[in-house]
Interface confidence: low
C-alpha cells in the first residue's frame, strides 16, 4: 500500500525563544528512502532537517530514527525565532539516483509569537510653549502575530492618535508599529507624562509602556514684575524683580541702570512650585542719595535662550 505521511497538527503557535515539536508519522516503512523536513513549497522550499548524518543547528529528531521499525519522524526546533514562521512539510523520498519524492505531509503552519520591543516615545526637538500643539511618536518593533493594540494616555486620560500604522501590511515574520499623537501643551504640564501603552498576545495582559515626560518638551516663560519696596532708610530704595512660574530652570537676570549693566544674576536658589515650575526673586538695593535725577532701572530676564523680557522701574531723584 502507498505510504502516507501524517502531520497531525495543522498549525502550532510558539513563543520566540521557546521550543516546538512538529509531529510526523508514516504509515509504512517502505519504500526505503529518506524523510526530510522542508519549510515552504516548490523550488524555493528550504531544507530544515534530514534524517541522515547531516547536522542541523537547533533541529533534532524526537525519536530514534535509526531504529528499523521507527515510524516517528517528528522534529524539535529549539530557540524559535520569528524567521522560523511558515508552513513545514514532512516529505518521504524513495531511494534512487536521484531520490524521488513520493509523498508529503499536509503541512504544519508555525506561528511564532514574538514580544514587541519596549515602546520608545519621541517628541519634538525643540520645546513647545503653552497652547502649542506638539506631536509625539511611539515605536515598537519585532512582534508577531500582527494583531497589536496601542493606546496613548496623558495624565491617565486616553488620547486619540493622529495615525497608527503596523508595517509591513502583508504577511511577514515580524512587525513594527508606529503611532503619532498630538498634544496641546498647557502651563500645568511640567509634571505631566504622555504614555504609550502596547498590548499584545505575548504580554499576558501586562502591556508595555513608553513614557515621555512633558518637562522635556515644554517651556513656560516667566511672568516678570519689578516692584519698589518701602525704603528701609532715607538713603536706600529696595527694588525687587520677580520671575514667576517658569520652566526649565535656565534663567539669567540682569539689572541695568539707565541702560547700563549694573549687576548680573545667575540664579541658584530657585523656588519650586507644586506644578513643577520655578520662581526667582532678585533684590536690588539702590543708594538714593547718589541719584539727584530720576533713574530708570531695568530688570532683564533671559529664559532658556529666548529673547529677553524687560521690565522698567523709575526711581525718582532726590
Amino acid at each position: 500500500t502507498e505510504v502516507k505521511v501524517i502531520q497531525p497538527e495543522k498549525s502550532v503557535s510558539v513563543a520566540a525563544g521557546d521550543s516546538t515539536v512538529l509531529n510526523c508519522t508514516l504509515t509504512s516503512l517502505l519504500p526505503v528512502g529518506p524523510i526530510r523536513w522542508y519549510r515552504g513549497v516548490g523550488q524555493s522550499r528550504q531544507l530544515i532537517y534530514s534524517f541522515t548524518t547531516e547536522h542541523f543547528p537547533r533541529v533534532t529528531n524526537v525519536s530514534d530514527a535509526t531504529k528499523r521499525s521507527n515510524l516517528d519522524f517528528s522534529i524539535r526546533i529549539s530557540n524559535v525565532t520569528p524567521e522560523d514562521a511558515g508552513t513545514y512539510y514532512c516529505v518521504k523520498f524513495q531511494r534512487g539516483s536521484p531520490d524521488t519524492e513520493i509523498q508529503s505531509g499536509g503541512g504544519t503552519e508555525v506561528y511564532v509569537l514574538a514580544k514587541p520591543s519596549p515602546p520608545e516615545v519621541s517628541g519634538p526637538a525643540d520645546r513647545g510653549i503653552p497652547d502649542q500643539k506638539v506631536n509625539f511618536t511611539c515605536k515598537s518593533h519585532g512582534f508577531s502575530p500582527r494583531n497589536i493594540t496601542l493606546k496613548w494616555f496623558k495624565d491617565g486620560q486616553e488620547l486619540h492618535p493622529l495615525e497608527t500604522t503596523v508595517n509591513p501590511s502583508g504577511k511577514n515574520v515580524s512587525y513594527n508599529i508606529s503611532s503619532t499623537v498630538r498634544v496641546v501643551l498647557n502651563s500645568m504640564d511640567v509634571n505631566s507624562k504622555v504614555i504609550c501603552e502596547v498590548a499584545h498576545i505575548t504580554l499576558d495582559r501586562s502591556p508595555l509602556r513608553g513614557i515621555a515626560n512633558l518637562s522635556n518638551f515644554i517651556r513656560v516663560s516667566p511672568t516678570v514684575k519689578v516692584t519698589q519696596q518701602s525704603p528701609t532708610s532715607m538713603n536706600q530704595v529696595n527694588l525687587t524683580c520677580r520671575a514667576e512660574r517658569f520652566y526649565p530652570e535656565d534663567l539669567q537676570l540682569i539689572w541695568l541702570e539707565n541702560g547700563n549693566v549694573s549687576r548680573n544674576d545667575t540664579p541658584k536658589n530657585l523656588t519650586k512650585n507644586t506644578d513643577g515650575t520655578y520662581n526667582y526673586t532678585s533684590l536690588f538695593l539702590v543708594n538714593s542719595s547718589a541719584h539727584r535725577e530720576d533713574v530708570v532701572f531695568t530688570c532683564q530676564v533671559k529664559h532658556d535662550q529666548q529673547p529677553a523680557i524687560t521690565r522698567n522701574h523709575t526711581v525718582l531723584g532726590f
Epitope: 500500500t1 502516507k4 497538527e9 498549525s11 509531529n23 508519522t25 503552519e109
Partner: antibody, heavy 119, light 107 residues
Framework: QVQLQESGPGLVKPSQTLSLTCTVS??????????WSWIRQHPGKGLEWIGA???????YYNPSLKSRVTISVDTSKNQFSLKLSSVTAADTAVYYC???????????WGQGTTVTVSS | DIQMTQSPSSLSASVGDRVTITCQAS??????LNWYQQKPGKAPKLLIY???NIEDGVPSRFSGSGSGTDFTFTISSLQPEDIATYYC?????????FGGGTKVEIK
C-alpha cells in the same frame, strides 16, 4: 467509495455514558492519511465538532467536552467509537461520524443517529 | 477557540439569483476553511475545501474565496435544489469550529 454508518442506543438516561460506533465500509480505516471525526447537532442548531482520531494514535478533543469524551479505534473491525460520560439533556443531539482528508475537509459523513437523553 | 461568525443567518432569494454568504474568523486561519451544505434531515455535504477549492462532483455554480479572517461563499445562480443550510468550518486550529449556519430559501 468509503461509507460510514453510526450505531448505538437512541435513548440514554441522564448521568449515564453515551456509546456510539461508526463502521467504515468501502475502505480501510487503517489505510492512513485521514482523520475520523465525531460531530453533533443539537435540535434546530448548528454543528459542533466533538473530536477526531487518526488510526495510529493521535486523538484530538474539543476542550468543551474533553473531560467527558473518549474516542477510540478498532482497526480489526474497521470501526471507531465515541463515549460521552455523565450525559444530561443538553447532550440530546444528532451525532454524526465523518472522514476527514488532509486537503478535502470532511468529505464523507454517516447519515447521523439521534440520541435523546431522558429518564 | 476560533469563533466563526456567519452572515446572514437566513436569506430568501429567487431562482437564478446570485447568493453570497460571508464567514468571519476571530483570528487568522489562512485558507483553512471548508463550506458545507446541509439539507433538512440529511448529513452535511462538503462543497468547498481550503476556502476556494470545489469538491469533486459539486456544481460549478458554487464557489468560495477569501483568506485570513474574511471568507465568502457564492451561489452564482440559485437553483430550487439549493434550498439548505450552509456552514463554514475552520480547521486551522483545534478545536475545529463551525459557523452558525445560513438558511437559504426560495422566494
Amino acid at each position: 467509495q468509503v461509507q460510514l454508518q453510526e450505531s448505538g442506543p437512541g435513548l440514554v438516561k441522564p448521568s449515564q455514558t453515551l456509546s456510539l460506533t461508526c463502521t467504515v465500509s468501502g475502505g480501510s480505516i487503517s489505510s492512513g492519511g485521514y482523520y475520523w471525526s465525531w460531530i453533533r447537532q443539537h435540535p434546530g442548531k448548528g454543528l459542533e465538532w466533538i473530536g477526531a482520531i487518526y488510526y495510529s494514535g493521535p486523538i484530538y478533543y474539543n476542550p468543551s467536552l474533553k473531560s467527558r469524551v473518549t474516542i477510540s479505534v478498532d482497526t480489526s473491525k474497521n470501526q471507531f467509537s465515541l463515549k460521552l460520560s455523565s450525559v444530561t439533556a443538553a447532550d440530546t443531539a444528532v451525532y454524526y461520524c465523518s472522514k476527514e482528508g488532509y486537503h478535502s475537509g470532511m468529505d464523507v459523513w454517516g447519515q447521523g443517529t439521534t440520541v435523546t437523553v431522558s429518564s | 477557540d476560533i469563533q466563526m461568525t456567519q452572515s446572514p443567518s437566513s436569506l430568501s432569494a429567487s431562482v437564478g439569483d446570485r447568493v453570497t454568504i460571508t464567514c468571519q474568523a476571530s483570528d487568522d486561519i489562512s485558507d483553512y476553511l471548508n463550506w458545507y451544505q446541509q439539507k433538512p434531515g440529511k448529513a452535511p455535504k462538503l462543497l468547498i475545501y481550503d476556502a476556494s477549492n470545489i469538491e469533486d462532483g459539486v456544481p460549478s455554480r458554487f464557489s468560495g474565496s477569501g483568506s485570513g479572517t474574511d471568507f465568502t461563499f457564492t451561489i452564482s445562480s440559485l437553483q430550487p435544489e439549493d434550498i439548505a443550510t450552509y456552514y463554514c468550518q475552520q480547521f486551522a486550529y483545534l478545536p475545529w469550529t463551525f459557523g452558525g449556519g445560513t438558511k437559504v430559501e426560495i422566494k
